[in-house]
């Protein structure tokens, strides 16, 4: 989604004194070099003992508007035989990121910085066994 929208509810954009565009450079620069992204493994989500799927989270009023989020496939972990191990739990690893959210009904549009928790993958942990008293 675009970051600087115009709205029919906003002042006349034809007016010479109206600030039509606030240009913000939102390009993401890769300081580690161009080759780093090609090394990102995309098959861990299937090979992991706590496999996950990725979902395309869309929000037109957010920048970035598209964020890929992980969701654990199972509550339990997968053992070497490919069966679910009921002594081990699959848990989501979450990362806090900063996003820009469009303020509703503001003219010109303004954005606020918000924190967002995003699932980035899943890991396997031992189940908590509660002893009977």
């Amino acid at each position: 989604a675009a970051i600087i929208p115009q709205s029919s509810a906003c002042p006349n954009t034809e007016a010479k004194d109206f600030l039509q565009n606030v240009k913000v450079n939102l390009k993401v620069f890769n300081s580690l070099g161009a080759k780093v992204s090609s090394r990102r493994p995309s098959d861990y989500l299937n090979r992991s003992t706590s496999p996950w799927t990725l979902h395309r989270n869309e929000d037109p009023d957010r920048y970035p508007s598209v964020i890929w989020e992980a969701q654990c496939r199972h509550q339990r972990c997968v053992n070497a035989e490919g069966k679910l191990d009921h002594h081990m739990n699959s848990v989501l690893i979450q990362q806090e990121i900063l996003v820009l959210k469009r303020e509703p009904e503001s003219c010109p549009f303004t954005f606020r910085v918000e924190k967002m928790l995003v699932g980035v993958g899943c890991t396997c942990v031992a189940s908590i066994v509660r002893q009977a008293a």
């Epitope: 989604a1 675009a2 929208p5 115009q6 709205s7 939102l26 390009k27 993401v28 161009a34 080759k35 992204s37 090609s38 990102r40 995309s42 098959d43 989500l45 299937n46 799927t53 990725l54 979902h55 395309r56 869309e58 037109p60 920048y63 970035p64 508007s65 598209v66 890929w68």
Partner: antibody, heavy 119, light 107 residues
Framework: EVQLVQSGAEVKKPGASVKVSCKAS????????FHWVRQAPGQGLEWIGV????????AYNQNFRDRATLTADKSTSTAYMELSSLRSEDTAVYYC????????????WGQGTLVTVSS | NIVMTQSPATLSVSPGERATLSCKAS??????VGWFQQKPGQSPRLLIY???NRYTGVPARFSGSGSGTDFTLTISSLQPEDFAVYFC?????????FGQGTKLEIK
């Protein structure tokens, strides 16, 4: 120079499957989403789905969820779209297109692959 | 799903004249609209993104406007190579949808 080169035309029988490829060059393959769009003869464009080669994530148009499978091979910078249980209505030109996820638009398109479904 | 409706289906204009193509969304799509040109046997070519931004290398005679539900593509002075089919498309929310196209023909 960014290029998306698709595989050649296919003729299939109803009920069969087809797998169309789209080879990317001129940029880092894993940085952008690949979307697949089809165009039936003389018709408009219909969005099939998306794959992100960087993380393997996929999303589909509900109309294709049960029959379309999108995959990507990072070693060859190639995206694939497989459509199963073909019927005559699937006769169309299938396009791959690169989507700039942050900027939010389709910029480069493949040349298209004509898939004809006929008994 | 968001429906994109283009009008007219066919537009006959003489070279050198101005052409105005319309696209209406079934619900607000902010400015998340693109315009594509397609010639017979070719793939779509991006002209305008975010409703009014001209894509790299697109001639200045092409301009886009609108927000919310109503969008317009204007070609100020038609050149012979501009006669083609034009599609609008929304990427506000998936499934991304396209208009049925406007065929721009020589009068």
């Amino acid at each position: 120079e960014v290029q998306l080169v698709q595989s050649g035309a296919e003729v299939k029988k109803p009920g069969a499957s087809v797998k169309v490829s789209c080879k990317a060059s001129g940029y880092t393959f894993t940085d952008y989403e690949f979307h697949w769009v089809r165009q039936a003869p003389g018709q408009g464009l219909e969005w099939i789905g998306v794959i992100h080669p960087g993380n393997g994530g996929t999303a589909y148009n509900q109309n294709f969820r049960d029959r379309a499978t999108l995959t990507a091979d990072k070693s060859t910078s190639t995206a694939y779209m497989e459509l199963s249980s073909l019927r005559s209505e699937d006769t169309a030109v299938y396009y791959c297109t690169r989507f700039l996820t942050y900027e939010g638009y389709f910029d480069y398109w493949g040349q298209g692959t004509l898939v004809t479904v006929s008994s | 799903n968001i429906v994109m409706t283009q009008s007219p289906a066919t537009l006959s204009v003489s070279p050198g004249e101005r052409a105005t193509l319309s696209c209406k969304a079934s619900q607000s799509v902010s400015i998340d609209v693109g315009w594509f040109q397609q010639k017979p046997g070719q793939s779509p070519r991006l002209l305008i993104y975010h409703a009014s931004n001209r894509y790299t290398g697109v001639p200045a005679r092409f301009s886009g406007s609108g927000s919310g539900t109503d969008f317009t593509l204007t070609i100020s002075s038609l050149q012979p190579e501009d006669f083609a089919v034009y599609f609008c498309q929304q990427d506000y929310s998936s499934p991304y949808t396209f208009g049925q196209g406007t065929k721009l023909e020589i009068k």
